[in-house]
Amino acid sequence: AQGKEVVLLDFAAAGGELGWLTHPYGKGWDLMQNIMNDMPIYMYSVCNVMSGDQDNWLRTNWVYRGEAERIFIELKFTVRDCNSFPGGASSCKETFNLYYAESDLDYGTNFQKRLFTKIDTIAPDEITVSSDFEARHVKLNVEERSVGPLTRKGFYLAFQDIGACVALLSVRVYYKKCPELLQGLAHFPETIAGSDAPSLATVAGTCVDHAVVPPGGEEPRMHCAVDGEWLVPIGQCLCQAGYEKVEDACQACSPGFFKFEASESPCLECPEHTLPSPEGATSCECEEGFFRAPQDPASMPCTRPPSAPHYLTAVGMGAKVELRWTPPQDSGGREDIVYSVTCEQCWPESGECGPCEASVRYSEPPHGLTRTSVTVSDLEPHMNYTFTVEARNGVSGLVTSRSFRTASVSINQTEPPKVRLEGRSTTSLSVSWSIPPPQQSRVWKYEVTYRKKGDSNSYNVRRTEGFSVTLDDLAPDTTYLVQVQALTQEGQGAGSKVHEFQTLSPEGSGNLAV
């Protein structure tokens, strides 16, 4: 921001009323008046260039310093070319001297040169030559000097002429302030510029109404430079929750809008499924039946638990069931849907039921499922199972009701045996198998069916109560199709998949385990 100038003395604006002291009186500096555009222009002039040993002084009135520490002196003046005078006027000068003196009281007409300290020799950038002077084209010069630090109650300025032809049209003395400033929603008071050029006065700002320093943020500070400029802003304020920045102020969020934290963002419109907020709201309450999870941002619409999964199917495959379902028709407005599967088994004879989580195996953990299918295995044959699939989302925990769908399935068969080739020779194959232990008590015998691959007209069957069998009298180097099926009191169980096993060729004979 531009520096603010506080004027202590303005000769040009005073209209010749200041009555400065001249010494010697009347013979050196004197006040003159000119009319320009029907307005009087006053100037102090001196032009005793033909006389040697000039020592003419012009002293201002006493100027009260007030709060100024460093003053700036702006001079507007003309200087005539010494060559305008005969022989270049050997005693003629083209400069004058600027002095100041501090004092705690006004000395009035008591003028003492010895009290004055020289500030500088003032030289013009442009001198006015004869032709310009006669054509009224005088060259106006502007020079600025500064003095500080000042410590007394007031001061005088003085101008010493030593034989120049000078007209002093303007003497303006001022000090600089960094102006009152609103920046970054912080108010910085008007501050007097310091007196020492390298120093920057640190000024603390105060947050405007309804603004705060953000957590972990720096308090607002600025630096007031000697020239009255604000520099190096540090920190800032932000509009608090429920308020937004409008120009340089924080304004309450309008009804129907909210802001949940101190930030630079504007107020946001209340999201879907919320009630209209009052002015200055930090959040918007949810409509009845809608909720906000603890981790949900205030900007997110309120949501509700999902409806039940859609189209739940249970497809039995021996002692396995594949459960499939489709997502709920109503997600509740959320994407964080998970599913939980629970299992209940019932004995057909007694109708007694109980949980079966401990005895069955799921293809993946049955709680927190994100996919819409799961396979349940290790089911016991001739049992009735009921599966429940519950859909949940981030707000399900906020209500007591549950959204679930159930499917029942009866297991009529054992699970297919898992078959392994244990060993082989040119004429035999040793085969073993296993089924889940809970089902083994139900099995009466195992039936092993085998045939040559490609021969669909004949097959052989072997029955055994054990978990292995050696198939003899086989042809060498021949592939056989082998299947194992459990037999229960109620009938056949599920058959294993058909395996292809090959006997050894005569060259590589010997009973080799695989």
């Epitope: 010749g16 009323e17 009555g19 001249t22 009186y25 009347g26 013979k27 004197d30 006040l31 003159m32 008046q33 000119n34 009319i35 006053y42 102090y44 002039s45 032009c47 005793n48 260039v49 033909m50 006389s51 305008s84 005078f85 005969p86 007409t109 009224r136 032809c165």
Partner: antibody, heavy 120, light 109 residues
């Protein structure tokens, strides 16, 4: 209105004294330098003396220096010229005049003049 | 002797333009002021500074300066302009405070 009214002129013998007065009205007397200018019969204008607004500074033409004294009473808005050791060549119409700005003029307001005759 | 020199007399026909000059070293440094004096009356300020007229002075009166010379010009002189005219300037030599020219008698024929 702005005016200067003079009094005190007259006939005086050589070596004698006379005090001229100039009463100001219509302006802030204490803000202006005041001058005396004289005009010998049939001659031109001759500057005599000046006094600063507060009365702290005075100057005289060489021809009257040491014999004439300029003074003012700002409380009475009056300018004076005390003339001592008068000579025949001091015979003139004496005018008081106001310097419109600064010490040296221009002279924008003039009194009506008062005749001083020095003769035996 | 006066340090500002004027011609003792100048004449002009009514309606004509006349110029009265004033010579002196001080005029290099300071502007001249011009006064009109009619018989039996106090002088009256006509021109001061670069070319400034106090209110009430007709605009047929104008002033100019060049080097050591200052001029008063009456454009379209009138009978009532017949009077004595004096130039005046600050003294740049330091000998005097202010000096008058010897005066010029203007006759309007």
């Amino acid at each position: 209105q702005v005016q200067l009214v003079q009094s005190g002129g007259g006939l005086v013998q050589p070596g004698g004294s006379l005090r001229l007065s100039c009463a100001a009205s219509g302006f802030t007397f204490s803000s202006y330098a005041m001058h005396w200018v004289r005009q010998a019969p049939g001659k031109g204008l001759e500057w005599v003396s000046v006094i600063s607004p507060a009365g702290t500074n005075t100057y005289y033409a060489d021809s009257v220096k040491g014999r004439f004294t300029i003074s003012r009473d700002n409380s009475k808005n009056t300018l004076y010229l005390q003339m001592n050791s008068l000579r025949a060549e001091d015979t003139a119409v004496y005018y008081c005049a106001r310097a419109s700005v600064g010490a040296t003029g221009p002279f924008d307001i003039w009194g009506q003049g008062t005749l001083v005759t020095v003769s035996s | 002797s006066s340090e500002l020199t004027q011609p003792p007399s100048v004449s002009v026909a009514p309606g004509q333009t006349v110029t009265i000059t004033c010579q002196g070293d001080s005029l290099r440094s300071y502007y001249a002021s011009w006064y009109q004096q009619k018989p039996g009356t106090a002088p009256k300020l006509l021109i001061y500074g670069e070319n400034n007229r106090p209110s009430g002075v007709p605009d047929r009166f104008s002033g100019s300066s060049s080097g050591t010379s200052a001029s008063l010009t009456i454009t379209g002189a009138q009978a009532e302009d017949e009077a004595d005219y004096y130039c005046n300037s600050r003294d740049s030599s330091g000998t005097h405070l202010t000096v008058f020219g010897g005066g010029t008698k203007l006759t309007v024929l």
